[in-house]
């Protein structure tokens, strides 16, 4: 948690003497007003408790680690919520103090309530000046609950909040109806994000077991220690009159911490300093009690005496919270003989020790080869050992050598030496080598000579198009294998660089020198050949082509078909994106148009030689469909068709086309030309007996016209299998065979 304390001076006889001070013990604080990081902010928060406007409050800064608020002119100025904000970035933290008027109608039995998720919170407002009217409870300034004045129990109005959740946190108030809000009892409810003894996302982690009234932070599992206590589990008491995470701050004034309220980051809230209690923190602890708000009991054994600031003071040879443990020589446990770190990293080194008295954070130290002594930043206290964690400053090569962990207690001391090897992350001395290239991929050999230390654990290849500002693409590869960079753009230069890593945190070396590798795109050399084309309608053309057979892979991405309309001076281009395609259907052409057609293979943006051109005449729009088509079976192999000529013909009919298909058959239909356009009847011969056929027909002038309706007819039975249908025409008027 952030080392931030908001102190309120509660000597309230004169509001002008009242002050609030916010003190930061964070690293970087205390270096003057230009210290790194955002400044401390201390302000009255009028969002929930609004007070009548008065002269502005005065803010005085003492460097960057302390700020004080003064200038309170009347008691009502003091009532409400004050907040101090400190810490940088993600550690920025707000500490809140709630001030109640001593002359209020209702007073809180306890201002700060810290509860666990799912607990029942009970806020108790004590009647100080009775009014025979309802009591309104509010949460964060909004109405919450009403109590009839008869509902007071033993002169107290209670608000029970069952199964509280983190959103229930905030400022609560109890106010008599018709009374001024300044006469309210104000409370602060802090709901930890986890159940008792748990912390972390999903609340799966177990709290360390905070001592002396410390509260486990639900986000990081650290103990927020009451003022006057320190250590990872708040196991150590500060000297009288001191506070802060490392006991580094001193209470102002000659009477120490008397009359001061201390507010710390959530989920702790506020309390008196160690050794003091009462609504104004002016009362010393009763005998046998100690700590913040005098909430702790000494219960000293083996001749220990109770100190109201620190608890039991043990005689020689004894230690422990109640002087219940005898001393023995400390011992360092399970220290590795050799450790390896990468240059410029800031590793954490752990050193575990046991003994009686139990080693605490301050009793374990780490010594570097140059004699520098590091103090632990954190200690994990377990029943059988204390593990001190040291945050090592950025390593340099000179840090290689023998380090020493030392533990000292009143029971004696112990030390262990271990070797630290500082390794240099590898940096490539040369660029990667290009092995082969294709239009869309490059094969690269990444492993090159390097400076620094091995072994190489990973190789990263960074690449992007030359002169591009886009992000680098990265591929992580096995050090022993060649790398294929895929999905590249053809005929494009790529800047390629290698980055090597060795095992361990901070093992990534700097990027090696870049090299330029260009993807390939050979010109397609094969000339396609137009095999044929087929008019499928007045505006549709089916084209087919071939390529010469050559050994090796086909160099090409697809085909480009070009149609040139010389009359209109227009070119139509059709892209066929598969190099395997050998046919294409061109639609939306202009009927009755003479086109020149060719096809060529393309690769990337390069075009191969064009095929010899073909000249294609698209028929103009065809005539309307023949009318009243009718089919009549004549025998087991003959069916006669009759029809009427189309109406509104644009010119003379050159022929009719009849389509014959077996009903329900899967084969292709058969087309039969009727070459005498004056005919209105024809006989289709050579059909199979007892077979149902489908017929339709269309006329042709310069192009084929629309199909007529389809008619069905069956041949008669008992015939032999015919060789296939043929046609014979007749003029319907004459009734003669042709």
């Amino acid at each position: 948690a952030v080392d931030l304390t908001l102190l309120a001076n509660l000597r309230l006889t004169d509001p002008q003497r009242f002050f609030l001070t916010c003190v930061s013990g964070e690293a970087g604080a205390g270096r003057g007003s230009d210290a790194w990081g955002p400044p401390l902010l201390l302000e009255k928060d009028d969002r929930i408790v609004r007070t009548p406007p008065g002269p502005p409050l005065r803010l005085a800064r003492n460097g960057s680690h302390q700020v004080t608020l003064r200038g309170f002119s009347k008691p009502s100025d003091l009532v409400g919520v004050f907040s101090c904000v400190g810490g940088a970035g993600a550690r920025r933290t707000r500490v809140i103090y709630v001030h109640n008027s001593p002359g209020a109608h209702l007073l809180p039995d306890k201002v700060t309530h810290t509860v666990n998720k799912g607990d029942t919170a009970v806020l108790s407002a004590r009647v100080h000046k009775e009014k025979q009217t309802d009591v309104i409870w509010k949460s964060n300034g909004s109405y919450f609950y009403t109590l009839d004045w008869h509902e007071a129990q033993d002169g107290r109005f209670l608000l029970q909040l069952p199964n509280v959740q983190p959103p229930s946190s905030g400022i609560y108030s109890a106010t008599y109806l018709e009374a001024s809000p300044l006469g309210s009892a104000f409370f602060r409810l802090i709901v930890r994000g986890c159940g008792a003894g748990r912390w972390g996302p999903g609340c799966t982690k177990e709290c360390p077991g905070c001592l002396h009234g410390g509260v486990c932070h639900d986000h990081d599992g650290e103990c927020v220690c009451p003022p006057g206590f320190t250590g990872t589990r708040c196991e150590q008491a500060c000297r009288e009159g001191r506070f802060g995470q490392s006991c580094q701050e001193q209470c102002p004034g000659i009477s120490g911490c008397r009359g001061l309220t201390f507010c710390l980051p959530d989920p702790y809230g506020c309390s008196c300093g160690s050794g003091w209690r009462g609504s104004q923190c002016q009362e010393a602890c009763a005998p046998g009690h100690f700590g913040a708000d005098c909430r702790l009991q000494c219960q000293c054994q083996n001749g220990g005496t109770c100190d109201r600031f620190s608890g039991c003071v043990c005689p020689s040879g004894w230690h422990g919270v109640h002087c219940e443990k005898s001393d023995r020589i400390p011992q360092i446990l399970n220290m590795a003989s050799e450790l390896e770190f990468n240059l410029e990293t800031m590793p954490r080194i752990n050193c575990a020790a046991a003994g009686n008295p139990f080693p605490v954070r301050g009793s374990i130290e780490l010594r570097k080869p140059d004699g520098t002594v590091l103090l632990s930043t954190k200690a994990i206290v377990e029943p059988e050992k204390t593990t001190a964690e040291f945050e090592v400053p950025r390593l340099v090569l000179a840090d290689s050598g023998f380090w020493e962990c030392r533990v000292s207690t009143s029971g004696g001391q112990d030390s262990r030496r271990f070797k630290v090897n500082v390794k240099v992350p590898p940096v490539p001395l040369a660029a990667p080598r290009l092995l082969t290239k294709q239009s869309r991929q490059l094969v690269v050999s990444p492993l090159v000579s390097f400076s620094g230390d091995g072994p190489i654990s990973t190789v990263r290849l960074h690449y992007r198009p030359q002169d591009s500002t886009m992000d680098w693409s990265t591929i992580v590869v096995d050090p022993s294998e060649n790398v294929t960079l895929m999905n590249l753009r053809p005929k494009t230069g790529y800047s390629v660089r290698v980055q090597l890593s060795r095992p361990g945190e901070g093992g990534e070396g700097a990027w090696g020198p870049p090299t330029l590798m260009t993807t390939d795109c050979p010109e397609p050399l094969l000339q396609p050949w137009l095999e044929g084309w087929h008019v499928e309608g007045t505006d549709r053309l089916r084209v087919s082509w071939s390529l010469p057979l050559v050994p090796g892979p086909l160099v090409g991405d697809g085909f480009l078909l070009r149609l040139w309309d010389g009359t209109r001076g227009q070119e139509r281009r059709e892209n066929v994106s598969s190099p395997q395609a050998r046919t294409a259907l061109l639609t939306g052409l202009t009927p009755g148009t003479h086109y020149q057609l060719d096809v060529q293979l393309y690769h990337c943006t390069l075009l191969g030689p064009a095929s010899p051109p073909a000249h294609v005449l698209l028929p103009p729009s065809g005539p309307p469909a023949p009318r009243h088509l009718h089919a009549q079976a004549l025998s087991d192999s003959e069916i006669q068709l009759t029809w009427k000529h189309p109406e509104a013909l644009p010119g003379p009919i050159s022929k009719y086309v009849v389509e014959v298909q077996v009903a329900g058959g899967a084969g292709d239909p058969l087309w039969i030309d009727v070459d005498r356009p004056e005919e209105t009847s024809t006989i289709i011969r050579g059909l199979n007996a007892s077979t149902r056929y489908l017929f339709r027909m269309r006329a042709s002038i310069q192009g084929l016209g629309d199909w007529s309706n389809t008619v069905e007819e069956s041949t008669l039975g008992n015939g032999l299998q015919a060789e296939g249908p043929v046609q014979e025409s007749r003029a319907a008027e004459e009734g003669l065979d042709q």
Partner: antibody, heavy 125, light 107 residues
Framework: EVQLLESGGGLVQPGGSLRLSCAAS????????MMWVRQAPGKGLEWVSS????????YYADSVKGRFTISRDNSKNTLYLQMNSLRAEDTAMYYC??????????????????WGQGTLVTVSS | DIQMTQSPGTLSLSPGERATLSCRAS???????LAWYQQKPGQAPRLLIY???NRATGIPARFSGSGSGTDFTLTISSLEPEDFAVYYC????????FGQGTKVEIK
């Protein structure tokens, strides 16, 4: 939307009983002071009874004391008025209303907001 | 109990005119606990003013309340057609009491 919906009114003979219900929605019913107000045909408004959120404290107008009982079921978000020994002068439109605390002039005060649409009780032989 | 007396019983005015409604308490009441309601035929009452002078949410600015002690006033600065209704004042000491109402009708 905050809403109150009364039901249970109807025609009843003198000396008979009736139970009115008021279903609340759109707010945390269990936190609010609730009440019944009635209005005889062509007359003004008359406060009948009130009940505190806990349900433990109830108050009645002198005209209904001993005959009417106000209650609430916070789990069902419902307010009730049990009317016994009904008289002809109890004939009225019965409204339920929420008592909403408002901040003004540096203190907290009450007003009836919102009201239900009412349910008609007719006591006649 | 405190009695609330409203006057006049009926007020006949035209749209656009100013309406002044009076409410007198039989003894001094806390102005924080005085409210005004509007009731139209066939509808439930609607809160207009609370704490003697504070407009409820959604109430137009032409409605205003004033007064203290025993005398309170509701003013409608310029009557709109939808303002013709019955208006009640109400107070709360130990219990709630309403005035008998003032009917504002179209002249």
């Amino acid at each position: 939307e905050v809403q109150l919906l009364e039901s249970g009114g109807g025609l009843v003979q003198p000396g008979g009983s009736l139970r009115l219900s008021c279903a609340a929605s759109g707010f945390t019913f269990s936190r609010y002071l609730m009440m019944w107000v009635r209005q005889a045909p062509g007359k003004g408004l008359e406060w009948v009874s009130s009940i505190y959120p806990s349900g433990g404290w109830t108050y009645y107008a002198d005209s209904v004391k001993g005959r009417f009982t106000i209650s609430r079921d916070n789990s069902k978000n419902t307010l009730y008025l049990q009317m016994n020994s009904l008289r002809a002068e109890d004939t009225a439109m019965y409204y339920c209303a929420r008592v909403a605390p408002y901040d003004s002039s540096g203190s907290v005060n009450y007003a009836f907001d919102p009201w239900g649409q009412g349910t008609l009780v007719t006591v006649s032989s | 109990d405190i009695q609330m007396t409203q006057s006049p019983g009926t007020l006949s005015l035209s749209p656009g005119e100013r309406a002044t409604l009076s409410c007198r308490a039989s003894q001094s009441v806390n102005s924080n606990q005085l409210a005004w309601y509007q009731q139209k035929p066939g509808q439930a009452p609607r809160l207009l003013i609370y704490g003697a002078s504070n407009r409820a949410t959604g109430i137009p600015a032409r409605f205003s309340g004033s007064g203290s002690g025993t005398d309170f006033t509701l003013t409608i600065s310029s009557l709109e057609p939808e303002d013709f209704a019955v208006y009640y004042c109400q107070q709360r000491s130990n219990f709630w009491t309403f005035g008998q109402g003032t009917k504002v009708e179209i002249k």
